[in-house]
């Protein structure tokens, strides 16, 4: 809190503003008749330094010419950027209690002059915007500097605006107010910046530009898209621009595409036809906008406009399998399936899918319509039938995919040779095969056809499966393919009117199971024993069991235990066993084993043959 | 409505300074550029100087450095800090309020709306 100055003063010099590096004197003088009462000779005036409201130093040692009792010179050298305060304190030596008093204060501002301000820049945000320039100052003053913006044009009419820097707010930019319309867009404007403070002054170099320079058009607005008779692949943008504009450039995409399709137009005048659109699909639309061919800037993107095309009649063709069960001998019952089109064939909302089955020779037709992929008859077991089924959405159906029903698996002359599954990684399995060795007729396709060997799969879940050519011998399946689960995989074998099949077991991924079967019932039967057992439950077999294996040895044995290894069959739940000796107790167990190993063993049970035994 | 009045002319010799002054009434008059326009006799109206609402400037390239034009919005008041007089500048100045937008329309007295009577400015030799 300095003093209204009523002691004395204090003087600068050079001035209160100096350059970095350079020393000033500070001068502190009292006023006549002010000082310590009764010994003016023992007045001693002292200068203390400030920065941030800190005391720093007491500048006593720094006198460089002193008249007692009534002024003092000190000399400051080593100032830092920004603003440092002193103060000028009377002490009066005689009373060693009183505090100095103050008299009077100075602040000294250090700085530098200012570089002349770079790379101009100046935009007008459409025709109706206003030209605002931005430009770099360079090194910061740590003064206050004003900055003059100049604009002169034709006319002979000069437009300028000033802002400051300080340590509080920086100025480099600044907004004329002041529009640059069409008329002068063949004008050539010259812009310059003018930095000034009490150190010096710098000017820019002169920065030429155009009306087509500088003027960035608004982004075009109002975007619609009109689809001509309701095409879904033909459509015509429509938008509003600002009247200069000669150059557009329409970016669109589909929603989940990661692309955009580019179209530059020229005089569009707001209209532009696009003919590639896919129909049904969502698409997203921007333009920009240049006011002139070969300078000036490109609008911002325009707001998207996020429309879908309408529908097409669906195009392509169904993925159809079929499977066959004799109900009794003169019925059976057919099962039809096949996969939705994918989006670029459905091409809108399928609504149903038209089945047919037909018997070829007497012309019976059954003929039905279903929003489902799968459609299941029961027929008779006689006759030549075929299938086909189309897909409807509003604007019409595919063209229907037909398929001969046969006896999938009833030609063993057309069943694959050598047919192995193997493991490819957590969620697929690679199968492969050999061709039919004797085959009557060519084989027009394979079929590759896997379902989860758990219960009740065959009527719950549709089957899987993939069409192969028939020169190639493998399928990659990955669809609905999971880890630790069992599948029956099998590679029918078709021609025009016959089918072969040859079948195997196989998983993605294996662990030993988690246990043993458990054993219901082991009973004698003419000199042999059956054991029975119920199955592992399907979440714990952890893959495809190879085989079974059934463990015995005498009760209260320390002796290995002697096994009999049984291959897998999923119908097998009972196996004879007959080297055991009569009236001798038992203990009998099962594990049962994957590719991964051998579980643990399941419940024992004891059991004490009666009969003879071999 | 906004009326106009100015303030200030009078008999200078070349090299001297005057200070015009116009005095606006009315409560919008910050919605307003402001302008002066001098006509010297036998000549068409000629715009020497004016200052948006956002107090950019803009003169004519013969006062460019001699002329100031500033704004005081509280007291409603524009002027014209004219030094370094020349016989040529000799003319009758008037106050302008208008709302020109573009580059184009700062010098086009058909621009402005409202005018002051003039005053009368005489640079001797």
């Known amino acids: 809190n300095i003093d209204v100055c009523k002691l004395g003063t204090v003087t600068v010099q050079p001035a209160p503003v100096i350059p970095l590096g350079s020393a000033a004197n500070i001068s502190c003088s009292l006023n006549p008749k002010q000082g310590c009462s009764h010994y003016p000779s023992s007045n001693e005036l002292i200068l203390l330094k400030f920065v941030n409201d800190v005391l720093v130093e007491n500048l006593h040692g720094k006198k460089v010419h002193d008249h007692t009792g009534h002024s003092s010179t000190f000399q400051v050298t080593n100032l830092s950027l920004g603003m440092t305060l002193f103060v000028c304190k009377l002490n009066c030596s005689n009373s060693q209690k009183k505090p100095p008093v103050p008299v009077c204060g100075v602040e000294i501002s250090v700085g530098v002059a200012p570089e002349p301000p770079q790379n101009i820049s100046c935009v007008q945000e459409g025709e109706n915007g206003t030209v605002a320039c931005s430009w770099n100052s360079g090194k910061v003053t740590y003064l206050k500097t004003n900055y003059t913006l100049q604009l002169s044009g034709p006319n002979n009419l000069t437009c300028q605006k000033q802002c400051f820097s300080d340590n509080r707010q920086n100025c480099n930019r600044l907004d004329l107010g002041i529009n640059l319309s069409p008329d002068l867009a063949e004008s050539r404007f010259i812009v310059r910046v003018t930095a000034i403070n009490d150190l010096g002054n710098s000017s820019s170099l002169p920065h030429t530009f155009t009306f087509l320079d500088i003027v960035i058009p608004l982004p075009p607005w109002d975007i619609r898209i009109n689809f001509l008779n309701a095409s879904g692949s033909r459509g015509t943008l429509q938008w509003e621009d600002e009247g200069q504009v000669v150059l557009n450039q329409l970016r669109y995409q589909p929603l989940n595409s990661t692309s955009w399709n580019m179209v530059n137009a020229t005089n569009a005048k707001g209209k532009y036809d696009l003919r590639d659109l896919r129909p049904f699909t969502e698409y997203e639309f921007q333009i920009s906008s240049k006011l002139h061919l070969s300078g000036g800037s490109w609008s911002n993107w325009s707001e998207s406009l996020r429309t879908r095309t309408p529908e097409e009649e669906p195009v392509g063709i169904l993925d159809i399998w079929y499977m066959k069960q004799d109900i009794d001998y003169d019925r059976q019952q057919i099962s039809l399936f096949w996969k939705s089109l994918n989006p670029s064939e459905a091409r809108g909302k399928i609504l149903h899918y038209q089945v047919t089955l037909q018997e070829v020779t007497k012309k019976t037709t059954l003929q039905n319509t279903t929003r489902h992929t799968s459609w299941t008859r029961v027929i008779p077991r006689t006759g030549a039938w075929t299938a086909s089924v189309s897909a409807a959405n509003s604007k019409g159906a595919s063209a229907p995919t037909h398929i001969n029903i046969v006896d999938l698996c009833g030609t063993g002359l057309l069943a694959p040779h050598q047919v192995s599954a193997k493991s490819e990684n957590m969620d697929n399995i690679l199968v492969t095969w050999q061709p039919p060795k004797k085959a009557d007729s060519a084989v027009r396709e394979y079929i590759v056809e896997w379902r989860a060997l758990q219960p009740g799969s065959i009527t719950k879940f549709p089957p899987h499966w993939l069409r192969i050519p028939p020169d190639n011998m493998s399928a990659l399946i990955s669809e609905n393919i999971k880890p630790y689960i069992c599948y029956e995989i099998r590679v029918h074998a078709l021609s025009e009117s016959q089918g072969g099949c040859s079948s195997i077991r196989g998983d993605s991924k294996h662990k030993a199971p988690v246990s043993g079967p458990h054993i219901t019932a082991i009973t004698e039967k003419k000199e042999r024993l059956f054991i029975s057992w119920t199955h592992i439950p399907f979440p714990e077999q952890r893959g495809c069991i190879l085989h079974y294996r059934i463990y015995w040895k005498e009760r209260d044995s320390t002796a290995q235990p002697e096994l009999c290894e049984i291959q897998y069959r999923r119908s097998q739940n009972s196996h004879p066993i007959s080297s055991l000796q009569p009236r001798v107790t038992y203990v009998l167990w099962m594990t049962a084993v994957t590719a991964a190993g051998e579980s643990p063993q399941g419940n024992e049970r004891e059991f004490c043959p009666q009969g003879k035994a071999n | 409505q906004v009326q106009l009045q100015e303030s200030g002319g009078g008999l200078v010799q070349a090299g001297g300074s005057l200070r015009l002054s116009c005095a606006a009434s009315?409560?919008?008059?910050?919605?307003?550029?402001m302008a002066w326009f001098r006509q010297a006799p036998g000549k068409e109206r000629e715009f020497i100087a004016a200052?948006?609402?956002?107090?950019?400037?803009l003169y004519i390239d013969s006062v460019k450095g001699r002329f100031t034009i500033s704004r005081d919005n509280a007291k409603n008041t524009v002027a014209l800090q004219m030094n370094s007089l020349k016989p040529e500048d000799t003319a009758v100045y008037y106050c302008?309020?208008?709302?020109?937008?573009?580059?184009?329309?700062?010098?086009?007295?058909?621009?402005?709306?409202?005018w002051g009577r003039g005053t009368q400015v005489t640079v001797s030799s």
């Open positions: 302008a309020a208008g709302m020109p937008y573009s580059y184009s329309d700062y010098p086009r007295d058909s621009k402005y709306d409202y």
């Open positions: 200052i948006t609402r956002s107090d950019t400037t």
């Open positions: 009315g409560r919008t008059f910050n919605n307003y550029a």
